[in-house]
Each structure stands twice: as C-alpha cells, then as structure tokens.
C-alpha cells in the first residue's frame, strides 16, 4: 500500500514488543516468536536468552523483556545477569581448579561460595582470642586481660566477612 511519510521517523512510533519492519514498508510488526524489544523504535527484535544446562529459567521471555536465568541447585550465579554458574562448595571449603578443597589452617569460609579468608588477628587490636576459629568460622576476639575489670564484659566479634569483589558500603 502507498502511504505518505510524515517528517518524523516512521519507526519512532513502534512500541516495545514491536520492530520497524523493513519488509513491510517500515510499519511496526510484533516481535517474532522467541524474541523481544524492550524499548520503542527498534529496527529489530533481540533473540530471547535460553536458560539451558546448568542454567534454569527464573523469568520467561516476553515480547518486551528478555528471559532471566539462575542456576540449578548446587550452583550459584556469577557475573552480570547470571552470565555464569559456579559450583557450590561446603562451608569450610573453597572452589579451586581441582574442585572443592578444605580451607587451610588459619583460614575460614562461612559460605558455599567464595574463597577462604584468614582468621581475624585479634592481637592487632590488642585483643585476645576468646573463641578459636575453625574452617567454617572466624575467631571471636575478646578483651585483653588488662581490659577486664570486675563486672565488665567486652566481647568484640570480628567484622562480618564480605564477599570477594564487593566494596564496603
């Protein structure tokens, strides 16, 4: 069919979920199956992400938004938008190239992911070790003997462990 073009881009009126179809004289066509456009004015629709293998579907693809994946049990997400799945380990372990390995003496991991971190060095704060560390738990620092006065109790737990790659707030 013939149509008079307005001065504006004919594609600008295509809403999310459609694309400006060159095969149809630049009118807006719905996105084909298994594709989406999340913004208006698109000249193509993007192929939906498929959550296969160790990935599982957290949110189905729609004509206006991509699918979202997470990981099957025993794995956790890594990277933006869960671009990778990494194997879980037990608390007290870290993932190496050879698989899950126990934390070395003097280190701990209280999560199923991430690396083993050194126990807190209580003496750096002039404290003493109140509760010994394990592979799964950090030490608990207590007061130095000089700090103890009758009726006073001053137990300082160490700062909570941070996940690697996250900066403190």
């Amino acid at each position: 069919f013939e149509r008079t073009r307005s001065l504006q881009d004919p594609c600008s009126n295509c809403p999310a979920g459609t694309f400006c179809d060159n095969n149809r004289n630049q009118i807006c066509s719905p996105c084909p199956p298994n594709s989406f456009s999340s913004a208006g004015g698109q000249r193509t629709c993007d192929i939906c992400r498929q959550c296969k293998g160790v990935f599982r579907t957290r949110k189905e693809c729609s004509s206006t938004s991509n699918a979202e994946c997470d990981c099957t049990p025993g794995f956790h997400c890594l990277g933006a938008g869960c671009s990778m799945c990494e194997q879980d380990c037990k608390q007290g372990q870290e993932l190496t190239k050879k698989g899950c390995k126990d934390c070395c003496f003097g280190t701990f991991n209280d999560q199923k992911r991430g690396i083993c971190r050194p126990w807190t060095n209580c003496s750096l704060d002039g404290k003493s070790v109140l509760v010994n560390g394990t592979k799964e738990r950090d030490v608990v620092c207590g007061p130095s003997p000089a700090d103890l006065s009758p009726g006073a109790s001053s137990v300082t737990p160490p700062a909570p462990a941070r996940e690697p790659g996250h900066s403190p707030q």
């Epitope: 149809r24 066509s29 719905p30 084909p32 199956p33």
Partner: nanobody
Framework: AVQLVESGGGLVQPGGSLRLSCAAS????????MVWYRQAPGKQRDFVAS???????IYADSVKGRFTISRDNAKNTTYLQMNSLKPEDTAVYYC???????????????WGQGTQVTVSS
C-alpha cells in the same frame, strides 16, 4: 490464504466507545499474530495493537489504557474495544494477520479492507 473482514466502525462522540471486529477465514491455523493498524488521511499507517497466538498483547502508547485487543478462538474473530475515544483516534482501522516467522520475515501478510472510525461531536 486468509480472508479478513472488519466491522464495527462508525461515527461516535468524544468519550464514547466502539468495538471493532475482524473475522478471519481460510488458513487460520497458521496465523501467528493479529494486528490492528489505523491510517488517518495523509498520514502513515500506524500500529494500534496486536495479539499473538499465545495471547501476548502489545499496545501503542497512544491507546494504552483505552483500547483492548482480544480474540475469540471459537469464532476466529479478533476484537478491538475502544473506550474514551478522542478526535485524534479518527482513522480507517485495518485488521492484519501475520503468518509464522521464517527467520527473515513473516511468511504471509494479509489485510482487511478497513473500517472507518470517526470521533466528532
């Protein structure tokens, strides 16, 4: 082939309602999407709303919240319920059926003859 026949157009006052119908016949088993477009005199043919075989709906921003596209599979008919009509909704409304996607384009593209909608006091 797919044959499409629109009905339900007419003259309505601003704020009024109309329901357009698009009856499909022929090779309807292969329809992926039914789409409503409209064309005002001297203007381009604009997307209004679409509904896919899976029931997914899309609306142009200008009609969102006022128009509703639906279908009755038993009657092979697609509807466009138009509420709170405005003078700028005046146009010829066309029904369009799209076949399955072959990776490059829709395999077919059939149009109805159009039905006039005029919104005026």
């Amino acid at each position: 082939a797919v044959q499409l026949v629109e009905s339900g157009g007419g003259l309505v006052q601003p704020g009024g309602s109309l329901r357009l119908s698009c009856a499909a016949s022929g090779s309807i088993f292969s329809i992926y999407a039914m789409v409503w477009y409209r064309q005002a005199p001297g203007k381009q043919r604009d997307f209004v709303a679409s509904i896919t075989s899976g029931g997914s709906t899309i609306y142009a921003d200008s009609v969102k919240g006022r128009f509703t596209i639906s279908r009755d599979n038993a009657k092979n008919t697609t509807y466009l319920q138009m509420n709170s009509l405005k003078p700028e909704d005046t146009a010829v409304y066309y029904c369009n059926s799209l076949g399955s996607w072959d990776g490059e384009r829709y395999e077919y593209d059939y149009w109805g003859q159009g039905t006039q909608v005029t919104v005026s006091s």
